[in-house]
Interface confidence: low
Amino acid sequence: EEELQVIQPDKSVLVAAGETATLRCTATSLIPVGPIQWFRGAGPGRELIYNQKEGHFPRVTTVSDLTKRNNMDFSIRIGNITPADAGTYYCVKFRKGSPDDVEFKSGAGTELSVRAKPSAPVVSGPAARATPQHTVSFTCESHGFSPRDITLKWFKNGNELSDFQTNVDPVGESVSYSIHSTAKVVLTREDVHSQVICEVAHVTLQGDPLRGTANLSETIRVPPTLEVTQQPVRAENQVNVTCQVRKFYPQRLQLTWLENGNVSRTETASTVTENKDGTYNWMSWLLVNVSAHRDDVKLTCQVEHDGQPAVSKSHDLKVSAHPKEQGSNTAAENTGSNERNIY
C-alpha cells in the first residue's frame, strides 16, 4: 500500500479581513493512525493553530467530522480573519506514539494572504491661514490596508494635482500598511468654495475609491480691498462718508473710523453680504458734522481682518465751504452703520 501523503491543494488563499478562511487538507490513507495538527509557519518557532487530539481553538472549526473512523478530510476554517493571521499554514500528520505522538508527514503549506481595507483617508491642512498666491501643504493618511499595493491621487475640485509625495509604510513585509501623502496647493482668490480631495484606491474596495476632503475655506484668507467715498450731503452740516470693504474671507473683521487720527468709532462686521465666490462685502458709514470742524478733516477707515495687521484708506473732507456752527462739539454721529448692500 502506498505511503500516506498529506495534500494541501491550495498553494495560496486570499481572504478579506473579517471573513472566514478555509484551509484545505486531505490525507491519502488512514494509516498510520494518529492525529492531524495545523501550524502557522515551519521550524521550531511554528505556531499551533489546531490540534485534533486536544486543546481549545475557538476560532477554528473543522470542515468534516474528524471523529468518524474513515475520515481523511482535515480541512479547517478560521473565523474572523485579521491581517495578523497572514502566513503559511501547514497541515501535519502525526503517528501515534508513546509517550508522545511523532510527526509523520507535512503538507506543502498554504499561504494565507489577508486583504484589509484602508481606513477612510483623513486630509489635514496647514495650521495657519494663508493668502492667495501662496503654496500650502495638505496631508492625507490612510491606515490598516493589505496588501501593500495602493493608489493615491489628489484633486483640487475636479482637477488632478501632480505636486505631491507619497510614502507607504513599512517598506518591508507587514500584516498591514499605512499611506501618507503630502500635496502642495497654490491658493487663488476664488478658492473659498474649493475642496482638496485625497482619493485612495485599493484592491479591497468594492465601490468607488475612498475619498477624504478638506475645504479650502478653512485654509484661505482673502484680504479685503477698501474704498472710502463721500456721499452727497444729507443735511446742511452733515456729510455721509462710506467705507466699502470688499472681497474678504473669513468674516472676522473689525473696522475703526479715525478723524484726524483720533478714534471715532469701532465696529465689527456683522450684516455682511456674500459674493458668488464665497468672499464677503461689508459697508460702514459715518455721518460727519462738518460744523464741528474749523479745518479740513482727514477721515481714515482702518480695518483689522482676521487678526492681521490693520490696513487703512483715507479720505480728505473739505469743510471750508460749509458755514461753522459755534459751540457744536459733535464730530460724528454713530447711528446707522452696516447698511446692507449687494454688489
Epitope: N157, G158, A201, H202, V203, T204, L205, Q206, G207, D208, P209
Partner: antibody, heavy 123, light 107 residues
Framework: QIQLVQSGSELKKPGASVKVSCKAS????????MNWVRQAPGQGLEWMGF????????TYAQGFKGRFVFSLDTSVSTAYLQISSLKAEDTAVYYC????????????????WGQGTLVTVSS | DIQMTQSPSRLGASVGDRVTITCRAS??????LAWYQQKPGKAPKSLIY???YRYIGVPSRFSGSGSGTDFTLTISSLQPEDFATYFC????????TFDQGTKLEIK
Amino acid sequence: QIQLVQSGSELKKPGASVKVSCKASGYSITNYAMNWVRQAPGQGLEWMGFINTYTGEPTYAQGFKGRFVFSLDTSVSTAYLQISSLKAEDTAVYYCARTRGYYDFDGGAFDYWGQGTLVTVSS
Amino acid sequence: DIQMTQSPSRLGASVGDRVTITCRASQNVGTHLAWYQQKPGKAPKSLIYSAIYRYIGVPSRFSGSGSGTDFTLTISSLQPEDFATYFCQQYNTYPLTFDQGTKLEIK
C-alpha cells in the same frame, strides 16, 4: 501605455457563433474588471456585464444571459466575449472597457475602451 | 433599472460657445456618474467620472457637476474637435445604464 486591442470585424450567418477578443496591455489584466458594451447601429451604448478578472467570475446584465459568455485567458492578458446562436439583432459593435476600480470593484466608470469589434449577422 | 435621460438630444452650437448638457437619473445615484464622448465610427472616450473628476488628459474646458439625480456636463469654450455625441452613465446600481446621448452639432 494602457491599451485594449480587440479582434477584427466578423460577418456571420444566423445560428453561428462568434468569439471576440480583447487584449490588454500596459497593465495587469487581473487588477481591473473587464466590461462588455454593445452598440447597435445608430443606437446608444448598452452594458452587457463584466468579468471579474481575478476570479474569472462573470456577471451578466438581464438581456445577456444564456447566449453570451465572458471568459478570460490571463496568460495572454485577453478577455473574450462569445455569442452563440447568432441573430440578426446581434448585429452591433461590441466594446470591451476597463473599469476604474480594481478587480473586485464590480463594474463602474470605464477609463479605457477597446476600439470596438463590428459583428454583422446576415444570411 | 435606473433610466438615464439627457437633454437636449441634439444641440447646435458654434466654436467658442459655452455648452451645457444635462443628464437626469430616474433615482438617486449619488455621484456615481460618468460622461463619455463618442465620434462617428470611433470608440467612446472617457471624460468624467464620479460626476466631477476629469480623467488625465481631458481638457479643462470640460467640467462636470451635480449629484443625486441631476447632472451637467459643461464645455466652457467649444472647440472644433468637441463636436460629437456625449453619453452619461450611472454606476450606482445594476445594471449600469447609459442615456441615449446628446449629439452636439455645428450650428
